[in-house]
Amino acid sequence: ALDAAYCFRNVQDNCCLRPLYIDFKRDLGWKWIHEPKGYNANFCAGACPYLWSSDTQHSRVLSLYNTINPEASASPCCVSQDLEPLTILYYIGKTPKIEQLSNMIVKSCKCS
Amino acid sequence: ALDAAYCFRNVQDNCCLRPLYIDFKRDLGWKWIHEPKGYNANFCAGACPYLWSSDTQHSRVLSLYNTINPEASASPCCVSQDLEPLTILYYIGKTPKIEQLSNMIVKSCKCS
């Protein structure tokens, strides 16, 4: 799997999980989230060469098509596969609120 | 939706469905498929600017992150959203076989 266990251990130009820390205030301009101040969002990036972690029949076909037709621009792309939620604390006035924000953290990637 | 109805009607540099006909023999080197000779596989391509068809909270956050941090390389990517199967006919000796190949045709795209 193109996850932290594999990608953060290996120097990999191909599609892989990349570390990215997002500070809510500095990077997004969101001042209302009290905790956490930021989080490890991560992101997916890298080349998708022939059959590198292709996730659908279409991306496999596209991968083969590109190998045979190298001038083509129809190549698969490195995107998130597994995502996890993030729990945040914010305040409504003085009242604390806890919310779970879905699909905020990328755990693994794929070529699609 | 970034589907044929929208994308094939509009000239769109941003993430959109692109037409792609694949000839099994010429483009993939597959001679064993009897029918069809090829099919409209389509593919997804184009830029993913700020919030253009972002499909997850993570891709929305990443989109905002890129707007505020333009030097960052952590941008969403244009990939397939809805896929459909393709039915093929091939022969085992003289015996015809009909198979449905899943996820072979891209019907719409998203930024992920």
Partner: antibody, heavy 121, light 107 residues
């Protein structure tokens, strides 16, 4: 230019529901809190609740809890306020108003033009 | 709930004079070094518009004839060199506690 454009006036019967829309433009709708405020004829302003469109997070004033539902459609940058079990006391102008952005509960820097809801049998 | 009381309920001011409106909260609206008090003007037939943010910060595009002061429970909005265009209802608003609440208005 930030704009909040609300749907037109409504006339409803007692016990019915009303759904008011607020179409926004000129800013990133999904990343700002959207508030709803009502103003009865000749009266002051009452905060009804708020929604953060990106995640659909909502906070309601207990005074309206159970009768008001706030939703948002990020694809069209439109916020909605639905008020059920309408009664004569709900006759008012209803406003959508964008939160300032520093806090969840905050001042409101842009307002819609208002939607008059009349309840009459 | 925090109750906001504005005085006076109505006010008539001659052009070029100074007007003062008071807003008293039923409990302190100060937290984390800020006063969570804001002022709005609602002109006849219009929506409210934000004038003052966090007790004393002039909102962008608002005339510097408007100023806000105060802390804790007592706040004041001052309008210097009053113009006919300043006619309307002025509201204070707190967001220190849920639910957010407004004063009853000063005309």
């Amino acid at each position: 230019e930030v704009q909040l454009v609300q749907s037109g006036a409504e006339v409803k019967k007692p016990g019915a529901s009303v759904k008011v829309s607020c179409k926004t433009s000129g800013y990133t709708f999904m990343f700002y809190w959207m508030n709803w405020v009502r103003q009865a004829p000749g009266a002051g302003l009452d905060w009804m609740g708020q929604i953060f469109p990106a995640w659909g997070m909502t906070n309601y004033n207990e005074m309206f809890e159970g009768r008001v539902t706030l939703t948002a459609d990020t694809s069209t940058s439109t916020a909605y306020m639905e008020l059920s079990s309408l009664r004569a006391g709900d006759i008012a102008v209803y406003y959508c108003a964008r939160g300032y952005g520093n806090y969840a509960l905050d001042a409101m820097d842009y307002w819609g033009q208002g939607t008059l809801v009349t309840v009459s049998s | 709930d925090i109750v906001m009381t504005q005085t006076p309920p109505s006010l008539s001011v001659s052009p070029r004079e100074t007007a003062s409106i008071s807003c008293r909260a039923s409990e302190s609206v100060d937290s984390y070094g800020n006063s969570f008090m804001h002022w709005y003007l609602q002109k006849p037939g219009q929506s409210p518009q934000l004038l003052i943010y966090l007790a004393s910060n002039l909102e962008s595009g608002v005339s510097d004839r408007f100023s806000g002061s105060g802390s804790g429970t007592d706040f004041t909005l001052r309008i210097s060199r009053v113009e006919a265009n300043d006619t309307g209802v002025y509201y204070c608003q707190q967001n220190d506690e849920d639910p957010l609440s407004f004063g009853q208005g000063t005309k």
